[in-house]
């Protein structure tokens, strides 16, 4: 529990401290405070480097100090041999003694109080953005005029952010443009189109002054532009470095516009307007898109009809053509289908005749059927040679698509009648 | 067959055999048996064997069994109370549709039946091959089949024999075109329980093909001359019965 | 005669593996293509592999594909079906049948008895 | 898929009866690869007509089929004990799978 002020003792003091001692004290203060920790007492028997016995002060992971050996006040007035004043909460006070002692030696007495540190000077980092206010256990940031103090409490910036552009077309500029932009600012604006519109963005390189990067080529200012998942910048400089032109493949895109402290041009300003979604012209085989256009975009509707030969499958229900819509993300419908050679199958199998199994039975694919030769013979014409139409039937230049015929060959013995004689 | 000589039934792969009454037909297709039309009067069920040479009832177990579906006789054939007293064999044709189709092989398959130009009228001496399990010299039935080459004959060869057993007058036996006569050569002749089966001529238009000219019907006495029913003559009958009582399947 | 005689079913676990066979005899085997059509118990008929007359065309019900593989000995006049990595759900009587005109199943086996089951 | 519906799932009739049994596919399907089978129980599937319209050998002439496009019909003109079995229609479209009806149920009334 944080106290305000206490007493540290070494073991037995003001009699003789015992050897092989270690004892640690943890002191804490409430937050916003320093600890000012004396010893009125000093009496640790020396050593180099206080190696033997000691007490250590230590802060965090800084040794603050260590002591041993006889200490007298230098000033008459005050009873102090000594002092640490730290700007944090807690300190930690540890006393050491070895296994054997020369002389009796009775330690140390120390007392700390809790002091008021002034945030606003007492550290390197200045806590404020602005203006910093000290007060007894603490510190508040405040702002110049129309300057606003962001939830971390410390940093000010304009109020820039939070507009959200629905319109197809519009402009937007940095705070105060073509003014110098306010410091250590972030501005957020957002576009939200409606889904299949893609945000386009366009600067003019004189419509661009951010300050410039550092040496290391980190830009200090800096302007961002983020649609999903891609990243535009960041940008900054004196003109825009970046393409003038920015399809960004997405209804909704975030501009994010970061100061910092210092350097403040007269920023920004861009057109944005939403071009429908663009669907890429796919490489679909075998097939011919209708209407034919150079670009298609959002809401495009196009009729993909398989060439001859080729059919959709869908299921297992085969089609020639099939409709594909530029959808909102860019994609096509339908992207799945494809043109494939129609299947004519297993070819039907015939009466007293037979099919050699074919190498395919895909479009183009040729059999021939033969009837159980010498006893049936193809009545019907046609050769017995069927190819894969395009239809998905087996078909005969004679016969179309009607199955040859198998029918008994009339009137030969296998075995003409020989007479015996008598 | 009366004065014939033993056959192969590779030799006549067409011949049918009933077994009740005992008799022929000729196969003509896979769904169709041509016979005689007294062969079918008394029993429109027939029991009808392809493939074997022997009628031994153990052979014919291995043979293929035909089943009739449907008998059709030719509307001129006059049906009668008492048959066994006919003396007009006119007409004497039928047709047996089968159940199931007839697979062909070497020992099964169809006779051609006459086309309906001039080239398949006979002319006499025109040779033909009989065949059949009927009457023999030497016995009532023959077990193996029998078959015989014989020439065409006028009809007044025919109706010049004296009827062996006759039931009526030899004047009441009928003589019409639709008959063939055929034989009078060394006594080779068909006979009782070879009606019904072809009359095979060899097509004139190719030789490697034999045509059913004609189906044995009756004769006057057997070892003489034999008449037989003229085909040609029924070819149209023939066709169209058939292609009303077909499936599609054979369409 | 045209007969199909099926044999090769039984009781098998969970994931385990079968042979089908069917015997094809009375027609030239080999002229034919030849399914394999399976029926679960109280239920209708469910179509499962076809072969083309020389074998090397292949199809099958999307459920079965890649665990079932319909093949054929034409120097046999066999049809069989290997099943593998069977599950609950083929149980059922499986039958061979000959593929006629119009893919019209002409012929039929008796049907042999597949019983998946734990 | 092609998806055969048969209706009535089952139907109750009388011996001479007249029996309509139904079977819809969900896409239109050729003529020539719609068939019917017959099965009673315990025994394998029949052929019993082919090709919409074609009578499978020995089945009686008292049985017709009929139908094209997505509609067909297997009719019996006067029912006899024998016919009392299931129906099962069949399609086949040259990408597997052949597809058959759910059956429908000849029952006597």
């Known amino acids: 529990e944080p106290t305000m002020y206490g007493e540290i003792l070494s073991p037995n003091y003001p009699q003789a401290y015992p050897s092989e001692v270690e004892k640690s004290w943890d002191i804490e203060v409430p937050e916003g405070y320093g600890i000012h920790l004396y010893f009125t007492h000093l009496d640790i028997e020396l050593s180099e480097n206080c190696a033997y016995d000691s007490v250590q002060i230590i802060s965090g992971d800084t040794e603050e100090g260590r002591l041993c050996g006889q200490r007298s006040s230098n000033n008459p007035h005050s009873p102090i041999v000594e002092e640490f004043q730290v700007p944090y909460n807690k300190l930690q006070v540890i006393f050491k003694s070895d296994f054997s002692n020369e002389e009796r030696f009775t330690g140390f007495a120390a007392y700390y109080v809790a002091t008021d540190i002034n945030e606003c000077t007492d550290f390197v980092d200045v806590p404020c953005s602005h203006f910093c206010n000290n007060f007894i256990g603490g510190y508040f940031c405040s702002c110049p005029p129309e300057y606003f103090l962001h939830d971390d409490m410390k940093n000010c910036g304009v109020n820039c952010s939070g507009d959200v552009f629905t319109a197809l077309i519009g402009e937007i500029a940095s705070p105060n443009y073509p003014k110098p932009y306010p410091e250590n600012s972030r501005c957020e604006y957002q576009i939200r189109l409606e889904k299949g519109f893609q945000v386009v963005v366009t600067l003019r390189r004189e419509d661009f002054d951010v300050e410039a990067a550092d040496s290391a080529g980190n830009c200090l200012d800096s302007l961002v532009f983020v649609a999903g998942d891609r990243q535009f910048g960041p940008y900054c400089g004196h003109g825009f470095p970046g393409p003038l032109n920015i399809e960004t493949k997405s209804n909704a895109l975030d501009i994010i516009f970061q100061t910092d402290l210092t350097g403040q041009k007269k920023g920004w300003k861009l057109r944005y307007h939403g071009d429908p979604m663009p669907c890429p012209k796919e490489d679909t085989p075998n097939s011919v898109w209708e209407p034919a256009k150079a670009k298609y975009v959002f809401r495009d509707v196009v009729q993909i009809t398989c060439l001859d030969g080729f059919e959709v499958v869908e299921g297992r229900v085969g089609a020639t053509s099939f409709y594909s819509t530029c959808q909102s993300n860019g994609k096509w419908s339908n992207s799945k289908l494809k043109c494939q050679p129609v299947d004519c199958g297993i070819p039907e199998s015939i009466e007293n005749g037979k099919v050699e199994d074919p190498e395919s039975t895909l479009f183009g694919s040729v059999i021939r059927y033969t009837c159980e030769e010498p006893y049936y013979y193809m009545e019907n014409g046609g050769g017995g040679e069927y190819h894969c139409a395009g239809n998905g039937s087996w078909v005969n230049e004679v016969l179309g698509p009607e199955l040859p015929k198998c029918v008994p060959v009339c009137g030969v013995p296998r075995e003409p009648f020989e007479e015996k004689q008598r | 067959i009366i004065g014939g000589s033993d056959a192969d039934i590779k030799n006549f792969p067409w011949q049918v055999f009933f077994d009740n009454p005992w008799a022929g037909g000729a196969l003509i297709n896979e769904y169709w048996v041509l016979t005689a039309a007294h062969v079918v009067e008394g029993n429109r069920e027939p029991t009808m064997y392809v493939g074997s040479t022997s009628v031994q009832t153990s052979r014919l177990a291995k043979s293929k069994m035909l089943t009739p579906e449907h008998v059709f006789i030719h509307p001129g054939w006059k049906l009668l109370e008492v048959p066994e007293g006919r003396t007009n064999f006119d007409n004497d044709i039928a047709l047996v549709r089968l159940k199931d189709p007839v697979k062909m092989g070497p020992t099964v398959s169809p006779i051609c039946l006459p086309g309906t130009s001039s080239d398949y009228n006979l002319m006499d001496g025109d040779l033909g091959l009989i065949s059949g399990w009927g009457r023999t010299e030497k016995r009532d039935r023959a077990v193996r089949l029998k078959a015989a080459r014989l020439p065409v004959a006028p009809l007044r060869k025919c109706k010049e024999v004296k009827v062996e057993k006759p039931t009526a007058d030899a004047e009441a036996y009928v003589f019409t075109p639709n008959m063939i006569c055929a034989g009078g050569e060394k006594g080779m002749d068909s006979c009782k329980g070879d009606s019904g089966g072809a009359f095979a001529v060899q097509d004139p238009n190719d030789k490697t093909k034999f045509y059913a000219a004609g189906l044995v019907s009756w004769g006057p006495q057997c070892g003489t001359y034999g008449l037989y029913t003229r085909v040609k003559n029924y070819v149209d009958w023939i066709m169209k019965t058939m292609q009303e009582n077909s499936t599609p399947r054979e369409d | 005669e045209v007969m199909l005689v099926e044999s090769g079913g039984g009781l098998v676990k969970p994931g385990g593996s079968l042979r089908l066979s069917c015997a094809a005899s009375g027609f030239t085997f080999s002229n034919y293509a030849m399914s394999w059509v399976r029926q679960a118990p109280g239920k209708g008929l469910e179509w499962v592999a076809t072969?083309?007359?020389?074998?090397?065309?292949?199809y099958y019900l999307d459920s079965v594909k890649g665990r079932f593989t319909i093949s054929r000995d034409n120097s046999k006049d066999t049809l069989y079906l290997q099943m593998n990595s069977l599950r609950a759900e083929d149980t059922a009587l499986y039958y061979c049948a000959r593929l006629f005109t119009g893919y019209a199943m002409d012929y039929w086996g008796q049907g042999t008895l597949v019983t998946v089951s734990s | 898929q092609i998806v055969l519906t048969q209706s009535p799932a089952t139907l109750s009739l009388s011996p001479g009866e007249r029996a309509t049994l139904s079977c819809t596919a969900s896409?239109?399907?050729?003529?020539?690869?719609l068939h019917w089978y017959q099965q009673k129980p315990g025994k394998a599937p029949k052929l019993w007509i082919y090709s919409t319209s074609n009578l499978a050998s020995g089945v009686p002439s008292r049985f017709s089929g009929s139908g094209s496009g997505t509609d067909y019909t297997l009719t019996i003109s006067s029912l006899q004990p024998e016919d009392f079995a299931t129906y099962y229609c069949?399609?086949?479209?040259?990408?597997?799978?052949?597809?058959f009806g759910q059956g429908t149920k000849l029952e006597i009334k």
């Open positions: 072969i083309s007359s020389g074998g090397s065309h292949t």
């Open positions: 896409s239109s399907v050729s003529s020539s690869y």
């Open positions: 069949h399609q086949y479209y040259r990408l597997p799978p052949h597809t």
